[in-house]
Interface confidence: low
């Protein structure tokens, strides 16, 4: 007998063809011999089956000897053998209805697990293969699990259910909730305004949550909360902000924080934690602030950086258009008795300048000027 696979919630059309290309009497029955539908002349008649309100046919095709059974809003329990009786013949069609659902919300936090559950009719033994948006294949039976979801897992998952050498395809849209970047570093000269941005890697119609920026200043013995906030329908409202520093926060997404001045006492690293309503767990983004200061005190020209710098970063002091006078993998460098001119303090990584501060050294009878 013919096998047809259907998807839960979809519509299926089971075909039945007579040799005569004209409208003749036909009946569709289920395996219990209960009439589903048929015709009386040009009228569609329905039997007492459970499919009553979901079963239909195409009258326009009857004159061509085609008597389809259309079942709308398919349910797993519609899986059955359907018999078309026409011209003293019986055509049997086995319908197998499958459903595939994500057993949790389809919006999942980065690092969480996705479980896809297959609903299948009794007696069936389907195999399932799913392909993630990044091309990763997973196979399984009634359930498929993917642990430690990554940002690249966001998108449409295509799952193929195979049964009796027939297949049916499901598409499930998965949104992995995460920040675009796990970590970021901001390099600033002392006194400059600092902008921290925390863009999300997803868009949803309605976004609700709350969050906090917890900060560990390099020069402080303990970490503290710099700001707490609510996120309601993509609108940000500040709950509490520490008095020093006096952070400001943008009212719209992406989450945006402004520190009026970069000061050595603020240099360090922070963790922005965002709790999304109805989600177990939180989103995190690490943010680091590196602050540079160049000063001349009496006969000593000093350049310092504060904050989380990697050991491979190079700190240099050089007179403009000349070779570096001093260059070290340290957080402070100095030159004694610097000659007059424009000095540059450079923080660089493999030759790439990350941060630069200029200081003008005047002849010894005057005081230094910082541009």
């Amino acid at each position: 007998k013919k096998v047809v696979l259907g998807k839960k919630g979809d519509t299926v059309e089971l075909t039945c063809t007579a040799s005569q290309k004209k409208s003749i009497q036909f009946h569709w029955k289920n395996s219990n011999q209960i009439k589903i539908l048929g015709n009386q002349g040009s009228f569609l008649t329905k039997g007492p089956s459970k499919l009553n309100d979901r079963a239909d046919s195409r009258r326009s095709l009857w004159d061509q000897g085609n008597f389809p059974l259309i079942i709308k809003n398919l349910k797993i329990e519609d899986s059955d053998t359907y018999i078309c009786e026409v011209e003293d013949q019986k055509e049997e069609v086995q319908l197998l209805v499958f459903g595939l659902t994500a057993n949790s919300d389809t919006h999942l936090l980065q690092g969480q697990s996705l479980t896809l559950t297959l609903e299948s009719p009794p007696g069936s033994s389907p195999s399932v293969q799913c392909r993630s948006p990044r091309g990763k294949n997973i196979q399984g039976g009634k359930t498929l699990s993917v642990s430690q979801l990554e940002l690249q897992d966001s998108g449409t998952w295509t799952c193929t259910v195979l049964q009796n050498q027939k297949k049916v395809e499901f598409k499930i849209d998965i949104v992995v909730l995460a920040f675009q970047k796990a970590s970021s570093i901001v390099y600033k000269k002392e006194g400059e305004q600092v902008e921290f941005s925390f863009p999300l890697a997803f868009t949803v119609e309605k976004l609700t949550g709350s969050g906090e920026l917890w900060w560990q200043a390099e020069r402080a013995s303990s970490s503290k909360s710099w700001i707490t906030f609510d996120l309601k329908n993509k609108e940000v409202s500040v709950k509490r902000v520490t008095q020093d520093p006096k952070l400001q926060m943008g009212k719209k997404l992406p989450l945006h924080l402004t520190l009026p001045q970069a000061l050595p006492q603020y240099a360090g690293s922070g963790n922005l934690t965002l709790a999304l309503e109805a989600k177990t767990g939180k989103l995190h983004q690490e943010v680091n602030l590196v602050v540079m200061r160049a000063t001349q005190l009496q006969k000593n020209l000093t350049c310092e950086v504060w904050g989380p710098t990697s050991p491979k970063l190079m700190l240099s002091l050089k007179l403009e258009n000349k070779e570096a006078k001093v260059s070290k993998r340290e957080k402070a460098v100095w030159v004694l008795n610097p000659e007059a001119g424009m000095w540059q303090c450079l923080l660089s990584d493999s030759g790439q300048v990350l941060l630069e501060s200029n200081i003008k050294v005047l002849p010894t009878w005057s005081t230094p000027v910082q541009p």
């Epitope: 949790s104 919300d105 309605k206 976004l207 609700t208 309601k232 309503e277 109805a278």
Partner: antibody
């Protein structure tokens, strides 16, 4: 100020048809999903149908599928519910509601319009 | 369809009382739950969304909690204007469904 005003209710015989309208003001209508919710006399609330911002997606409760049609005209800031093959059990106050609340909540509701199906 | 069952169906209380209304979903709905207040002859009014978040303008004596299948709405200090019917509603999957309602009456 957000406002939703329903109209079109009335007395209709079983098997008859009615078309309910809901005119929205005070917000960008085309940016929101919209719903119809009904309440039979002395009973609880029953969600009937909803439609996406542009009307491309529509969902219905099983009891009205095939009989009721939800549609919208964003140019007229209007939501409609075409009700055919009406039954006595469809008698209810019909509310138009905006799905503008977070977590898909219905944040604004109209005052309702009464539909009575009786012979 | 997901069934939403509210308990109790009615509660008699006095002004100043603490009232808790429960709502149970027949299957997990995460935090896709809203609470509405309805007064006779009026449209429902949104109180709580996302199971626990207070809608703007709603007094802080109202609070919601829960996750998955079991939820509750609490009115810490009942006020005269709180005597009404309260409905929970799931928005996890279509068709959206409401509880049968809980009437808070004056004792």
């Amino acid at each position: 100020e957000v406002q939703l005003v329903e109209s079109g209710g009335g007395l209709v015989q079983p098997g008859g048809s009615l078309r309910l309208s809901c005119v929205a003001s005070g917000f960008t209508f085309s940016s929101y999903w919209m719903s119809w919710v009904r309440q039979a006399p002395g009973k609880g609330l029953e969600w009937v149908a909803n439609t996406k911002e542009d009307g491309s997606d529509k969902y219905y409760v099983d009891s009205v599928k095939g009989r009721f049609t939800i549609c919208r005209d964003n140019a007229k800031n209007s939501l409609y519910l075409q009700m055919n093959s009406l039954r006595a059990e469809d008698t209810a106050v019909y509310y138009c509601a905006r799905e503008g609340g977070q977590w898909l909540a219905l944040d604004y509701w109209g005052q309702g319009t009464l539909v009575t199906v009786s012979s | 369809d997901i069934q939403m069952t509210q308990s109790p169906s009615s509660v008699s209380a006095s002004v100043g009382d603490r009232v808790t209304i429960n709502c149970r979903a027949s299957q997990g709905i995460s935090s896709w739950l809203a609470w509405y207040q309805q007064k006779p002859g009026k449209a429902p009014n949104l109180l709580i969304f996302g199971a626990s978040s207070l809608q703007s303008g709603v007094p802080s004596r109202f609070s919601g909690s829960g996750f998955g299948t079991d939820f509750s709405l609490t009115i810490t200090t009942l006020q005269p204007e709180d005597f009404a019917t309260y409905h929970c509603q799931q928005a996890n999957s279509f068709p959206w469904t409401f509880g049968q309602g809980t009437k808070v009456e004056i004792k």
